[in-house]
């Protein structure tokens, strides 16, 4: 659900954190239409997720903590 590196919508699947290696924040006020979290998977896929959903916030926080503790 992305076009020119912008997410246009969100995945309707819940991704497991074990498949996710990192994420990028997309901000609506920086050239894209919607706020999004772009998860980067081990299989080199980019998945657009809704930053308001609890599972997304949870994974973002786990990944951020992992980076902080490195």
């Amino acid at each position: 659900a992305s076009n020119f590196d912008c997410c246009l919508g969100y995945t309707d699947r819940i991704l497991h954190p074990k498949f996710i290696v990192g994420f990028t924040r997309q901000l609506a006020n920086e050239g894209c239409d919607i706020n999004a979290i772009i998860f980067h998977t081990k299989k080199k896929l980019s998945v657009c997720a809704n930053p308001k959903q609890t599972w997304v916030k949870y994974i973002v926080r786990l990944l951020s903590k992992k980076v902080k503790n490195m």
């Epitope: 819940i14 497991h16 954190p17 809704n50 308001k52 959903q53 609890t54 599972w55 916030k57 949870y58 926080r61 786990l62 951020s64 903590k65 902080k68």
Partner: antibody, heavy 121, light 112 residues
Framework: QVQLVQSGAEVKKAGSSVKVSCKAS????????ISWVRQAPGHGLEWVGG????????DYAQNFTDRVTISADKATKTVYMELRSLRSDDTAVYFC??????????????WGQGTLVTVSS | QPVLTQPPSASGTPGQRVTISCSGS????????VNWYQQLPGTAPKLLIY???QRPSGVPDRFSGSKSGTSASLAISGLQSEDEADYYC?????????????FGGGTKLTVL
């Protein structure tokens, strides 16, 4: 109707551990986060930690990181909270509470009945 | 020390309108939605308002919520004796050092 049913009251000695359970009934376990929230006598609510059972990954409030373990048994739809090195100020009612993780709100829509843990010195 | 700030007490007479405030910061209320819980004496908290201003089914429309910036408020109109309870605001917190979910210290509502 979804319910969270918690284990019974516990009286423990300072320095010991307690393990409280929270069993979900009436719904699948796959799209929930289960949190533990405690309330000391006459005090407000404090988030202890939580787990998304389908991820099998727990996280904790900083105050509790070294003393608490939250785990889930997907087969029995039960979440456990173990608190170690108990102190008298751990005396509180411990609630489990559910959040639906696929919604775009973080509300605890269903709560357990609470488990009173009393720590005596 | 609670992360969100609420007045410890509020009161009103039956039929009156009462408002309870909740103040936070950019990492919680400022960037996430606010939920309100009602706790009657000796019972578990109950969800009263979610996503700033949404009522779960079964909650009377006398209860309403709003949010502006880093503050939120709960309004109860047509106050009734059964509204006497503790009210807590809560929100997700984005700061890595704090807990995921943060609560206010609670407001004890007395119906005079």
């Amino acid at each position: 109707q979804v319910q969270l049913v918690q284990s019974g009251a516990e009286v423990k000695k300072a320095g010991s551990s307690v393990k409280v359970s929270c069993k979900a009934s009436g719904d699948t376990f796959s799209n929930f986060a289960i949190s533990w929230v405690r309330q000391a006598p006459g005090h407000g609510l404090e988030w202890v930690g939580g787990i998304i059972p389908v991820f099998n990954t727990a996280d904790y409030a900083q105050n509790f990181t070294d003393r608490v373990t939250i785990s889930a048994d997907k087969a029995t739809k039960t979440v456990y909270m173990e608190l170690r090195s108990l102190r008298s100020d751990d005396t509180a009612v411990y609630f489990c509470a559910r959040t639906k993780i696929e919604l775009d709100n973080d509300a605890f829509d269903i709560w357990g009945q609470g488990t009173l843990v009393t720590v005596s010195s | 020390q609670p992360v969100l700030t609420q007045p410890p007490s509020a009161s009103g007479t039956p039929g009156q309108r009462v408002t309870i405030s909740c103040s936070g910061s950019s990492s919680n209320i400022g960037s996430n939605t606010v939920n309100w819980y009602q706790q009657l004496p000796g019972t578990a908290p109950k969800l009263l308002i979610y996503s700033n201003n949404q009522r779960p089914s079964g909650v009377p429309d006398r209860f309403s919520g709003s949010k502006s910036g880093t503050s939120a408020s709960l309004a109860i109109s047509g106050l009734q004796s059964e509204d006497e309870a503790d009210y807590y605001c809560a929100a997700w917190d984005d700061s890595l050092n704090g807990p995921f979910w943060v609560f206010g210290g609670g407001t004890k509502l007395t119906v005079l």
